[in-house]
């Protein structure tokens, strides 16, 4: 560092800024001598408002330093990001956002739960709010799924009227023919591929309604589709194998007691979907009167043995192989309880006895020519077979 040119005048003796130190320390600094400034942890080099990673000044021949002394300013992480469907609380003190300050994120109770971490973040020396797991991005408030106001009641022939909050995941899809779907998370709808196939290239034409009880009621939450994803294995007009689709909504919907997503089945879900276990289908489809229902209706129906269902659809007018391993059947052998045209795409749901949450086991897909026919059953897309497909699309889009 020493380059002694006796003719040159020394530079002013540098004083380290508060919370910083200077190196190397010399008795005097002359031409071409330099010094660096290092800040204590939690402090950053700033020249005015501009941050620096490192600082070194060189003594010039006119006896001045080539650049001004920086400051060591306490790191300020700035206001933390807002948390959609949640809030942030300043723990250290009101609006304190500097080094070592602590904030606590929390989600709106009842309808949202925190994903990723415990919500506690600290302002670290690098200037980022950081969780105990080292994450810099804020946590996510994920909607609680499978909540219903319904207490399983007596089964009424053909179905009964739903009450507010009974099927808060129920989605009404208009734009082609009347169809249904089920809300997943807060911006996806699970439905049947055949129900929205005609709109697959015109997602914006789908009129999606949530939180509705009466089909024609003006009281609902409007949503619009951003994109439609039809299972690549589904072939229109060639049976109903892989009859599953996802609709991405262009905005997240606000979750409340009337709009709540359905859960996807856990690995263990098959234990709640054995033969004779009861599932519930809901929709505004054709009733016994042959008209679309005004009020959202539901029916509790048992799962039917797969072989029995396969056999039921092997005799004319049905062709063999109609019922595949990607389907499940539900209904009464005696008939009278079923889903019907207009219910397509809706969820057949089951109660998970361990979590006490409802999950989607089936998607209303197809059935006999005459709904509720004795010896015939409603056929549903078996959702558990498509969990990887669903999760892949949702995580990538």
């Amino acid at each position: 560092h020493h380059h002694h040119h006796h003719a040159s005048q020394p530079c002013p003796y540098p004083m380290a800024p508060p919370n910083g130190h200077l190196s190397p320390v010399q008795a005097k600094y002359i031409l071409k001598d330099s010094f660096s400034i290092f800040c204590e942890p939690g402090y950053e080099l700033l020249q005015g408002h501009l941050p620096l990673k490192s600082f070194a000044a060189v003594c010039q021949k006119d006896g001045s330093w080539d650049q001004p002394m920086p400051s060591c300013s306490i790191v300020d992480c700035g206001p933390p990001d807002d948390l959609p469907s949640g809030r942030v609380e300043y723990i250290t003190g009101p609006e304190v956002t500097t080094y070592k300050a602590v904030i606590q994120y929390s989600c709106e109770e009842t309808f949202y739960t925190m994903k990723v971490n415990d919500g506690k973040y600290v302002c670290e020396a690098d200037g980022f709010w950081t969780s105990s797991k080292g994450e810099r991005s804020p946590p996510v408030c994920e909607p609680v799924c499978g909540l219903s106001a319904r207490t399983t009641g007596g089964r009424i022939y053909g179905g009964q009227k739903a009450k507010p909050g009974d099927f808060p995941w129920q989605v009404l899809i208009l734009g082609g023919s009347t169809a249904a779907g089920a809300l997943l998370y807060d911006n996806w709808v699970l439905t049947a591929a055949h129900a929205i196939y005609e709109q697959k290239h015109d997602a914006s034409s789908l009129d999606i309604r949530l939180g509705a009880l009466k089909r024609l009621s003006p009281h609902y939450t409007q949503a619009w589709a951003e994109a439609v994803f039809i299972h690549e294995g589904y072939t229109h007009d060639a049976g109903f194998d892989n009859d599953i689709a996802l609709i991405k909504l262009n905005n997240k919907v606000v979750i409340n007691s009337n709009i709540t997503p359905i859960c996807l089945p856990r690995k263990e879900a098959e234990s709640f979907m054995r033969t004779d276990d009861i599932g519930t289908a809901s929709g505004w489809g054709l009733t016994q009167r042959g008209l679309l229902a005004r009020n959202l209706m539901y029916v509790d129906i048992p799962i039917v043995d797969h072989q029995k269902c396969t056999a039921a659809y092997e005799k004319p007018p049905y062709s063999g192989g109609s019922v595949t391993a990607n389907m499940l059947c539900a209904g009464l052998e005696s008939g009278g309880k079923d889903s019907c045209r207009g219910d397509a795409g809706g969820a057949l749901v089951f109660l998970d006895n361990e979590t006490q949450r409802w999950f989607v086991g089936g998607i209303v897909s197809w059935g006999s020519m005459n709904c509720g026919e004795a010896g015939q059953y409603g056929v549903y897309t078996k959702v558990i077979n498509y969990i990887p497909w669903i999760k892949n699309i949702i995580s990538n889009f």
Partner: antibody
Framework: DVQLQESGPGLVRPSQSLSLTCTVT?????????WNWIRQFPGNKLEWMGY???????SYNPSLKSRLSITRDTSKNQFFLQLNSVSSADTATYYC???????????WGQGTTLTVSS | QTVLTQSPAIMSASLGERVTMTCTAS???????LLWYQQKPGSSPKLWIY???KLASGVPVRFSGSGSGTSYSLTISSMEADDAATYYC?????????FGAGTKLELK
């Protein structure tokens, strides 16, 4: 030699989002300094929009904060500007720049002209 | 925010003439954090003076800068044709960084 090069669409419709890229050669954007976006309106007025620092932290002009996002891709040595809900008032030449008092370390791109029009 | 007011907005000078333009801040600015830029039509601004009075590399010694607090100036001791341009002051003492509206210097 350090060089900064802006790239962008040239024309954006009102209410849409504007995305610009600044590609830096000759110096790593993680090595030091603040990497700024500045715009110059047709009447030649200059406005500082914001920066992303070597560490990835951002600072925005309060007048734009609600519409502005500056991000980076360190693997490509690029930083980006996204300005939402643009209007004709956002018509300007956009510069990326490194502003510094370090001797001979102040560099600007050549600018990219953006017109907001339907 | 700190507003920088430059005056005059436009001026003209003859070859060899002494030229002074000013930059006035609405609140005090550290002299360490005041810069001047030169810009010619069709080009990006170029750093001209930093820390109020230090000339950027390649800037002729006929240029000088001075000032403190809220009052700063750029002076050309003897105008040359190549000096015709617009000059902007910039403060980065505090956020947001702000520019003056510029002084356009023309050759008379």
């Amino acid at each position: 030699d350090v060089q900064l090069q802006e790239s962008g669409p040239g024309l954006v419709r009102p209410s849409q989002s504007l995305s610009l890229t600044c590609t830096v050669t000759g110096y790593s954007i993680t090595s030091d300094y603040a990497w700024n976006w500045i715009r110059q309106f047709p009447g030649n007025k200059l406005e500082w929009m914001g920066y992303i620092s070597y560490s990835g932290r951002t600072s925005y002009n309060p007048s734009l904060k609600s519409r502005l996002s500056i991000t980076r891709d360190t693997s490509k040595n690029q930083f980006f500007l996204q300005l939402n809900s643009v209007s004709s008032a956002d018509t300007a030449t956009y510069y990326c720049a490194i502003i510094s008092t370090a001797v001979d370390f102040d560099y600007w791109g050549q600018g990219t002209t953006l017109t907001v029009s339907s | 925010q700190t507003v920088l007011t430059q005056s005059p907005a436009i001026m003209s000078a003859s070859l060899g003439e002494r030229v002074t333009m000013t930059c006035t801040a609405s609140s005090s600015v550290s002299s360490s954090y005041l810069l001047w830029y030169q810009q010619k039509p069709g080009s990006s601004p170029k750093l001209w003076i930093y820390s109020t009075s230090k000339l950027a590399s390649g800037v002729p010694v006929r240029f000088s800068g001075s000032g403190s607090g809220t009052s700063y100036s750029l002076t050309i001791s003897s105008m040359e044709a190549d000096d015709a341009a617009t000059y902007y002051c910039l403060q980065y003492n505090r956020s947001p960084l702000t520019f003056g509206a510029g002084t356009k210097l023309e050759l008379k």
